[in-house]
């Protein structure tokens, strides 16, 4: 397995643990969601990654100005996404690069599922019965 | 001891079986146990479900219903070492859509 597909809870460096919550969020389109990570903030900075599918590699999350915001208050880092859309679906990871070892540690990930119908066509299709 | 990443969620229709894997790299006879955390309920300890079934420590829940929803976490322990815990998989139980009153084949509808 690739290294990013596995993890352990090492007894090693101070930033070898990063906790993420919640594991799963299902919300209707347009709502605001928040996900959180708790870590030893003295060990290094936190960034956010995103992937659409389970078996993809996570990519650096491009923060959409005015809609997505990352904040950090000591050990607690938060990602806030306002007005969620279907294209926000996926798994979000927080990641910390250790200052002293340059090793990278990831949280477990938060899966976001945006609920509702994505198109008018889908909505019609569900309600249509042939005459 | 390494734990491999597991799916963040699993969607199963009402009445179907749910299969949870606990992939890890232990070559020894590791002890795999399964636990459930109710979503949004941060009580400790989580509900103990029992041991895994095969060398992969699979958990199978038969005939799933709404009450089975939650986060399923496996723990792997080698000997007296402290356990490693998976990230957990959230089980989503889907109600199958109701069959339409006019549940007929396309050919019949178009006659």
């Amino acid at each position: 397995a690739r290294s990013e597909d596995r993890y352990r809870n090492p007894k090693g460096s101070a930033c070898s643990r990063i906790w993420q919550s919640p594991r799963f969020i299902a919300r209707k389109r347009g709502f605001t969601v928040k996900m959180h990570c708790y870590m030893n903030s003295a060990s290094g900075n936190v960034s956010w990654l995103w992937k659409q599918e389970m078996d993809e590699n996570p990519q650096q999350l491009k923060l959409e100005k005015g809609r997505m915001e990352e904040s950090q208050n000591e050990s607690l880092a938060t990602l806030t996404i306002q007005g969620i859309r279907f294209e926000d679906n996926g798994i979000y990871f927080c990641q910390q690069k250790c200052n002293n070892t340059s090793e990278v540690y990831q949280g477990c990930g938060t899966e976001l599922r945006v609920m509702g119908f994505s198109t008018l066509a889908q909505l019609k299709q569900r309600n249509t019965l042939k005459d | 001891l390494w734990m491999h990443k597991v799916p963040a969620s699993l969607m199963v229709s009402l009445g179907e079986d749910a299969h949870f894997q606990c992939p890890h790299n232990s070559s020894n006879n590791a002890n795999v146990t399964w636990w459930r955390v109710l979503h949004g309920n941060y009580t400790w300890p989580p509900e103990f479900l029992g041991p895994g079934e095969d060398p992969n420590g699979t958990l199978i829940i038969q005939n799933v219903n709404k009450s089975h929803g939650g986060i399923y976490v496996c723990r792997v322990q080698e000997g007296n070492e402290s356990y490693q815990q998976s990230c957990g998989t959230y089980l989503r139980v889907r109600q199958p859509p109701p069959r339409p009153f006019l549940d007929m084949g396309e050919g019949t509808k178009n006659r």
């Epitope: 906790w19 708790y38 000591e74 607690l76 | 949004g40 309920n41």
Partner: nanobody, 116 residues
């Protein structure tokens, strides 16, 4: 509003032990992380130890093997057992609680001084 009540601070000799306790006026169902941070004079506040709702723990390198964090799950108590104390452990120790929704609460702090 959530109140955190710390107790157990004091003056200790190097090599001694001390136990800090913090109780939160909040339902234990509403706690994701319980932690202790500390702030030494002229330094930034830093994480000492934390325990989450899964019972997993994290420690700062400087206290590993000497400090132990634990909690009473029925109550909303978190304790920090500090053994083999060193002069560099001298600081104000703060209790920290985080809810699943990311609300963060802090105690007033309790002074720990390690000196011969």
């Amino acid at each position: 509003d959530v109140q955190l009540q710390e107790s157990g601070g004091g003056l200790m000799q190097p090599g001694g032990s001390l136990s800090l306790t913090c109780t939160a006026s909040i339902s234990s169902l509403s706690i994701w992380v319980r932690a202790w941070h500390r702030q030494a004079p002229g330094k930034q506040r830093e994480l000492v130890a934390a325990i989450n709702s899964d019972g997993q723990t994290m420690y700062a390198d400087s206290v590993k093997g000497r400090f132990t964090i634990s909690r009473d799950s029925a109550k909303t108590t978190v304790s920090l057992q500090m053994d083999s104390l060193k002069p560099e452990d001298t600081a104000v120790y703060y209790c920290n609680v985080v809810t699943p929704k990311g609300q963060q609460y802090w105690g007033q702090g309790t002074q720990v001084t390690v000196s011969s």
